[in-house]
């Protein structure tokens, strides 16, 4: 006994991104302490008076919570004793972006760490053969992106080729007037080739691949968050 709170404990955060309209997680870990009642977790946001979230004595204390986070925050209560102070954020808003501080106090000491939280919209692209077109075309669609991304096409056979002259990309604002639907059409495609549609903004990069042969169509999609970790 005797030196509670006098030592610094290691707190680790990871830069992350939130997909607006969906649930997000702000990651934070700390040196575990089996005494749950002695753990205090405070989440703060730069430029915001009041707390984002406070968890102490084994439960939420939202008496000082800022209004913009009301009803939308929670910690993983059953994982606090093993050092998880991550914050769940319900229905991520564009305005949730910013610098957050995860502050921890335990019987071993206290510590804090900052994280940058980016918000935007990102979704998997889907590529289909556009049979309605006059020539063989591929249509790449992704339902939700923000900020406006760049779209590029590539092909396995014509590596390094510039497809901007033979493709057409449009951005259609979604009903909530923030995110946009991305549609890109690639014309004059050849059979027995693999084409990739790459969509990227400063938050995420998504790729859709399609291989068209005489007998089948194979698809694959992947999405990667940028600058995370």
């Amino acid at each position: 006994f005797g030196i509670s709170g006098k030592h610094f404990i290691t707190v680790t955060t990871f830069t992350s991104a939130g997909n607006i309209g969906e649930d997000g997680t702000l990651s934070c870990t700390f040196e575990p302490d089996i005494k749950l009642n002695g753990i205090v977790i405070q989440w703060l946001k730069e430029g915001i008076k009041g707390l984002v979230h406070e968890f102490k004595e084994g439960k939420d204390d939202l008496s000082q919570q800022h209004e913009m986070f009301r009803g939308r925050t929670a910690v993983f209560a059953d994982q606090v004793v093993v050092g998880n102070a991550s914050l769940r954020l319900k229905n991520v808003q564009l305005t949730d972006a910013g610098t957050y501080t995860c502050y921890i106090r335990t019987s071993k000491g206290k510590g804090n760490a900052n994280l940058e939280y980016k918000t935007g919209a990102f979704s998997m692209p889907e590529i289909n053969v556009d049979y309605n077109a006059s020539s063989e075309s591929l249509r790449c669609e992704a339902p939700r992106w923000f900020p406006q991304p760049t779209v590029a096409w590539a092909s396995q056979v014509d590596q390094g080729a510039n497809f901007s002259e033979v493709s057409n990309t449009s951005f259609e604002l979604n009903s909530e007037n923030v995110t946009m639907k991305v549609v890109s059409v690639l014309y004059n495609v050849t059979i027995n080739n693999t084409y990739s549609c790459m969509i990227e903004n400063d938050i995420a990069k998504a790729t859709g691949d399609i291989k068209v042969t005489d007998s089948e169509v194979k698809r694959r999609s992947q999405l990667q968050l940028l600058n995370s970790g």
């Epitope: 309209g21 969906e22 649930d23 968890f55 439960k59 939420d60 209004e67 913009m68 009301r70 009803g71 939308r72 925050t73 929670a74 910690v75 993983f76 209560a77 319900k90 229905n91 808003q93």
Partner: antibody
Amino acid sequence: QVQLQQSGAELMKPGASVKMSCKATGYTFSSYWIEWVKQRPGHGLEWIGEILPGTSITTYNAKFKVKATFTADTSSNTAYMQLSSLTSEDSAVYFCARYYFGSSSFYFDYWGQGTSLTVSS
Amino acid sequence: QAVVTQESALTTSPGDTVTLTCRSSTGAVTTSNYANWVQEKPDHLFTGLIGGTNNRVPGVPARFSGSLIGDKAALTITGAQTEDEAMYFCALWYNNHWVFGGGTKLE
């Protein structure tokens, strides 16, 4: 104690709009989400969406994005759902429910008694 | 959209233990699905029982418990009582929307 009191049954004509209400008493209205749920015989329960009173934050089931609009008035502790361009498919009982989002749990606890909507010419 | 599947009906006797399950078409149910269980009695009387997989709603009797069993969410009634005869719905959260199961009629 906590109560969610919904407005009475409605009989509407196809193509019309209807606005139903859900009055909350016994708790801090702005601290809980209000969920809207549709029940049709043989179709079980269908989630329409949710609103966090006191904010403009809503989430809609994609299927109901054009059909439903949620609002909430914190001065009267009342949530509203408007359904537009009504068809016979909209005939159902509609429920509001309180949803708590917090570290200790995430639950629907209290439900309204339901508003019955019949769409018929 | 995901499909959530429940047993359509189960029969039990007073004092018995009965388990209702909730399966997701997208794979294993996890704690991130915040599994909820809701009871419906005649005349559209709904009551929340369990939230966040295993947390009892305040005021709900201790005989009701929630858990994950294998890849499914489960509601267990330990020592069922006659008043537990009702419809039970599970609801799973998929990051930005809820999906309800078809319900289990417990007799």
